[in-house]
């Protein structure tokens, strides 16, 4: 007498489920359930999600749409795709910025902030990998610069001092005479 039997909805098409008193067709993506059907295998009353709300999937029981997320300006986020009735806002970083996850196990829904990409040119280095999902990967020093500690230092143009090997093209020729 527990009422554990859940009768199968024997309707044409497979997107029917018992809602209210009958098996009803669910609502399409971008619509919420206003009222269940009032006949076997009938159509539920579905309404379009209001502005700034969405439902991404076909559904039977959502009587309201989910609120669209706002991109976090404090974290320098921007909207890559605006919210629609069927999809949430897609937040990301503007060009020249990359995503820095705020948790160690990073997934698409993880909180993040945007960081400005390293400018390899300003560091006098080659750009090995352009910045997108992670920071720019800078390579070796540009011509006319040599490695010194952590940075790239401009090659000397005078012959008075020593001429580093990487700078032969700049100052080395003068030492041949």
């Amino acid at each position: 007498q527990g009422g554990t039997r859940s009768p199968r909805c024997d309707c044409a098409g497979d997107f029917h489920k018992k809602i209210g008193l009958f098996c009803c067709r669910g609502c399409p993506a971008g619509h919420y359930l206003k009222a269940p059907c009032t006949e076997p295998c009938g159509n539920s009353t579905c309404l379009v999600c209001p502005q700034d709300t969405f439902l991404a999937w076909e559904n039977h029981h959502n009587s309201e749409c989910a609120r669209c997320q706002a991109c976090d300006e404090q974290a320098s986020q921007v909207a890559l795709e605006n919210c629609s009735a069927v999809a949430d806002t897609r937040c990301g970083c503007k060009p020249g910025w990359f995503v820095e996850c705020q948790v160690s196990q990073c997934v698409s829904s993880s909180p993040f902030y945007c960081q400005p990409c390293l400018d390899c040119g300003a560091l006098h280095r080659h750009t090995r990998l352009l910045c997108s999902r992670r920071d720019t990967d800078c390579g070796t020093c540009l011509p006319g610069f040599y490695e010194h500690g952590d940075g790239c230092v401009s090659c000397p143009t005078s012959t008075l001092g020593s001429c580093p090997e990487r700078c032969a093209a700049v100052c080395g020729w003068r030492q041949m005479f």
């Epitope: 007498q1 527990g2 009422g3 199968r8 018992k18 008193l21 009222a35 009032t38 006949e39 029981h61």
Partner: antibody, heavy 120, light 111 residues
Framework: EVQLVESGGGLVQPGGSLRLSCAAS????????MSWVRQATGKGLEWVSA???????FYPGSVKGRFTISRENAKNSLYLQMNSLRAGDTAVYYC??????????????WGQGTLVTVSS | DIQMTQSPSSLSASVGDRVTITCRAS??????????MHWYQQKPGKAPKLLIY???NLESGVPSRFSGSGSGTDFTLTISSLQPEDFATYYC?????????FGGGTKVEIK
């Protein structure tokens, strides 16, 4: 054993209000759709309202806006709040359980009913 | 709303008789391969009791002398051999749509 026991009936003046209760036992109340059905003396049966297990309510036009069905699963109870009562609402009111094998409304257990008389 | 018309409104019969009650709906109550017609028995001062669901399915515990048939708008409840405990009023009910409606009843009396 499935049992449905109605209470709350009585004599009320036209325009008055009454709240009927139905105490359910012997089954998992929250899993079932429930209805109220009434029967005027010597007359046929008339469906009055239904409350589905997933929380939806349904009414015929004759009582919509005047009657409100509700349920309290924790108390295994079904209720019918009747407002703006008319002489035509005089009847025995039955609480009925919908069959769990059915994805359509058919009533497999009924209470013994409670009499509502609307008269001045 | 779907109107349900039962006939006859009353009948007299003897124990052992074959009894047929009909119910006509104002529009078809059949859809999606099913006929949404049900039958109840009610004895004086008692609550209704479900006999038949979906036009022809016998409810658990109901004697096999009761049977139902029909589709569309015309349905029949048959008692193959009337027993003393069968003297009662019988109602049809549809669940093809809301509101649910019942027939006016057929009273089966002892001849």
């Amino acid at each position: 054993e499935v049992q449905l026991v109605e209470s709350g009936g009585g004599l009320v003046q036209p325009g008055g209000s009454l709240r009927l209760s139905c105490a359910a036992s012997g089954f998992t109340f929250s899993n079932y759709d429930m209805s109220w059905v009434r029967q005027a003396t010597g007359k046929g049966l008339e469906w009055v309202s239904a409350f589905s297990s997933d929380g939806y309510t349904f009414y015929p036009g004759s009582v919509k806006g005047r009657f409100t069905i509700s349920r309290e699963n924790a108390k295994n109870s079904l209720y019918l709040q009747m407002n703006s009562l008319r002489a035509g609402d005089t009847a025995v009111y039955y609480c009925a359980r919908h069959a769990d094998y059915a994805n359509y409304p058919v009533m497999d257990y009924w209470g013994q009913g409670t009499l509502v008389t609307v008269s001045s | 709303d779907i109107q349900m018309t039962q006939s006859p409104s009353s009948l007299s019969a003897s124990v052992g008789d074959r009894v047929t009650i009909t119910c006509r709906a104002s529009k078809s109550v059949s859809t999606s391969g099913y006929s949404y017609m049900h039958w109840y028995q009610q004895k004086p001062g008692k609550a209704p009791k479900l006999l038949i669901y979906l036009a022809s399915n016998l409810e658990s515990g109901v004697p096999s002398r009761f049977s139902g048939s029909g589709s569309g708008t015309d349905f029949t409840l048959t008692i193959s051999s009337l027993q003393p405990e069968d003297f009662a009023t019988y109602y049809c009910q549809h669940s093809r749509e809301l509101p649910l409606t019942f027939g006016g009843g057929t009273k089966v009396e002892i001849k």
